[in-house]
């Protein structure tokens, strides 16, 4: 008799999830010599332990604490790049500007990027059929709690000038409900962080508006200023040229505004 299984509103665990996490861990530790000591089997065991046999609407930050311990890593606190709704460009940027880090450039972020996972209460099974949706089912699900935990810790670690890349093509350039708006902004430490500098990325080729004057950017400035952190904003009118100039800063065309 097939066992009754809870139907959630979101997609199920990414296929081959255990193998993917383990393979990513091995790859990461091979690419980053300073992480060669990491035991990837222990990392997977800690990851699995955070959600297996637990109700997928009852996950806490504490569940991920064993994984956090194993993911200990040096991140230069003044080289942190946050992003919201523009992940691909942020990652392209840090692939070129190798001394800057997004969360997904760390071991923990790299392991979980673009994956979905959940278990079931009282069984050791991974649920490949469905997982809770943040809005329709519950917010304390394994994926949401993981990203809230690591995003909070990443923001707490930041210092000096913190950069954030924002998508100027969206109706809400700054969205209070995004991970950046709801978690990271509120966990920057005013005693450590001097300035938050927003880079607003333009989408249209002929878009010459000053998106730093957008009402949602003004809202971000207000939130940040109230936290005693300075705020600055730059328009990136040509993201393609911006990346090109990061690669080749001595190019003569890179002195003009991008």
């Amino acid at each position: 008799v097939p066992r009754w299984r809870q139907q959630w509103s979101g997609p199920g665990t990414t296929k081959r999830f255990p193998e993917t996490v383990l393979a990513r861990c091995v790859k990461y530790t091979e690419i980053h010599p300073e992480m060669r000591h990491v035991d990837c089997q222990s990392v997977w065991d800690a990851f699995k332990g955070a959600f297996i046999s637990k109700h997928p609407c009852n996950i806490t930050e504490e569940d991920y604490q064993p994984l956090m311990k194993l993911g200990t890593q040096t991140v230069p606190c003044n080289k942190i790049l946050l992003w919201s709704r523009i992940k691909d460009l942020a990652h392209q940027f840090t692939q070129v500007q190798r001394d800057m880090f997004t969360l997904e450039d760390t071991l923990l972020g790299y392991l979980a990027d673009d994956l979905t996972w959940c278990g079931e209460f009282n069984t050791s099974k991974i649920n490949y059929q469905s997982c809770p949706d943040w809005r329709k089912d519950c917010s304390n699900n394994p994926v949401s709690v993981f990203w809230k935990t690591v995003s909070r810790r990443f923001a707490e670690a930041a210092c000096d000038v913190v950069h954030v890349m924002l998508n100027g093509s969206r109706s809400k350039i700054f969205d209070k409900n995004s991970t950046f708006g709801s978690v990271e902004v509120h966990n920057l430490q005013p005693e450590k962080v001097q300035t938050l500098e927003a880079w607003v990325i333009h989408g249209g080729r002929e878009d010459s508006r000053d998106l730093c004057q957008d009402p949602t950017i003004k809202e971000l400035e207000s939130i940040i200023s109230k936290r005693n952190i300075q705020f600055s904003c730059k328009n990136i009118y040509r993201p393609d040229k911006f990346l090109q100039c990061v690669k080749n800063p001595e190019d003569s065309s890179c002195t003009s505004e991008i």
Epitope: Q73, T74, A157
Partner: nanobody, 117 residues
Framework: EVQVLESGGGLVQPGGSLRLSCAAA????????MSWVRQAPGKGLEWVST????????DYADSVEGRFTISRDNSKNTLYLQMNSLRAEDTAVYYC??????????RGQGTLVTVSS
């Protein structure tokens, strides 16, 4: 700007004890969780222990649980690590860092602990 200075390391025989200190400046010490991390020769960074800002909550790596004790004196802006029953595998440079991890940017020079007979 966060500044830390670690001290108290040295050469000790297996089974011996050491007490590390970390003097902090440039921030409101009591507002921040503090951690000890270590780096053994040729190895990566390993988290050792964390203590909450008020000192009430502590957490330890399995490898040091029951042997090491983290504490702090907020009136002196100082973090401590009492290390007992030291083993060869505890040999490392020990750093103190603000925050609870897992992402650390340690600002001090660290203090070298060598456990050898």
């Amino acid at each position: 700007e966060v500044q830390v200075l670690e001290s108290g390391g040295g050469l000790v025989q297996p089974g011996g004890s050491l007490r590390l200190s970390c003097a902090a400046a440039g921030f409101t010490f009591s507002n921040f969780a503090m951690s000890w991390v270590r780096q053994a020769p040729g190895k990566g960074l390993e988290w050792v222990s964390t203590i909450s800002g008020g000192g009430g909550g502590t957490d330890y790596a399995d490898s040091v649980e029951g042997r090491f004790t983290i504490s702090r004196d907020n009136s002196k802006n100082t973090l401590y690590l009492q290390m007992n029953s030291l083993r060869a595998e505890d040999t490392a440079v020990y750093y103190c860092a603000d925050g609870r991890g897992p992402f650390f940017d340690y600002r001090g020079q660290g203090t070298l602990v060598t456990v050898s007979s």
